[in-house]
Amino acid sequence: PEPPTACREKQYLINSQCCSLCQPGQKLVSDCTEFTETECLPCGESEFLDTWNRETHCHQHKYCDPNLGLRVQQKGTSETDTICTCEEGWHCTSEACESCVLHRSCSPGFGVKQIATGVSDTICEPCPVGFFSNVSSAFEKCHPWTSCETKDLVVQQAGTNKTDVVCGPQDRLRA
């Protein structure tokens, strides 16, 4: 019979014959022959392969370097790599998470629209009319101005995006 020019899924062509790929979590020790199956071996501790493969070496699990502010979010297996994240208060610089960035704070006049996570930074928004923020914070939203009327008071000083209104007593008309 004609030697194959293409192989089925999860197979590879070698020496004019189709051999089975090694399953995830295993590496290739020896190709198949006319008489033997592909020989595969499980990846060692702290190693992985995440695809059907013909690799002769497993990949090392990623090291989450605490010096870089990294910690393990999900421990690797023989089939998956370790997933790193950043310590509290910091987030990954990129998807690869090889270093960390300090969460930014929202300046006075801005409030937190979205709190930072391990993979994304704080998102700030300007405080709209009627709201203020007088602190630099990674958590605080814009606060609504105090309603003087509900306290039976009047506005003595208008609020801004950075300051609350100042309420005061209503002037009483003297008899």
Epitope: L68, G69, E88, T93, S94, S99, V101, L102
Partner: antibody, heavy 116, light 112 residues
């Protein structure tokens, strides 16, 4: 070997702008933030801001917020710091510095002189 | 902004003698995650700054072990057990607890 190579010295007129470059090599550019720190003659260090090349997300020191723009070009692994409306007090050495577990690598510095 | 204050501003030392630089922050640099975000840099004459100590007490790679860092939330010390001629330069402390990042004014170490 990680290297940060900055552009050459500049002499500028008051009111003009300057753009300093910092070319990174020896590591994955998008995996670390790039910061800019300046040092006026005989003075200390002052942080200006940074760019995250992965997201193109900058963060500025409010002191410079309206005058500084930090950008990054992923294709050339180069970070840029542009400072506008220059005044004599902006005369300084400008450094780029990579943030790893600290400012672990620094550029050689770019001297910017503002003089009429 | 967090204010970083160093003392002394000038430090003449005899080679072989110990040296100590103090740095005080206007706010505690101890984060709720347990780390203290205080860093020490040395700027040798005509050079860019270089890292000595990170997170208050961890010695950076390649830095001689005669350098050490210690402190609490707001008071920090950089110690050199035996000063050598190559240690001359300006020492800066820096906080990275929050933006803007801020540095101390610097301490100039010179050989007597």
């Amino acid at each position: 070997e990680v290297q940060l190579v900055q552009s050459g010295a500049e002499v500028k007129k008051p009111g003009s702008s300057v753009k300093v470059s910092c070319k990174a090599s020896g590591y994955t550019f998008t995996s670390y933030t790039m910061h800019w720190v300046r040092q006026a003659p005989g003075q200390g260090l002052e942080w200006m801001g940074y760019i995250n090349p992965s997201s193109d997300y900058p963060n500025y020191n409010q002191k410079f917020k309206d005058r500084v723009t930090i950008t990054a070009d992923k294709s050339t692994s180069t970070a840029y710091m542009e400072l506008s409306s220059l005044r004599s007090e902006d005369t300084a050495v400008y450094y780029c510095a990579r943030w790893g577990y600290s400012f672990d690598y620094w550029g050689q510095g770019t001297t910017v002189t503002v003089s009429s | 902004d967090i204010v970083m204050t160093q003392s002394p501003l000038s430090l003449p030392v005899t080679p072989g003698e110990p040296a100590s630089i103090s740095c005080r922050s206007s706010k505690s640099l101890l984060h709720s995650n347990g780390n203290t975000y205080l860093y020490w840099y040395l700027q040798k004459p005509g050079q860019s700054p270089q890292l000595l100590i990170y997170r208050m007490s961890t010695l950076a790679s390649g830095v001689p072990d005669r350098f050490s860092g210690s402190g609490s939330g707001t008071d920090f010390t950089l110690k050199i057990s035996r000063v050598e001629a190559e240690d001359v330069g300006v020492y800066y402390c820096m906080q990275h607890l929050e933006y803007p990042l801020t540095f101390g004014q610097g301490t100039k170490l010179e050989i007597k």
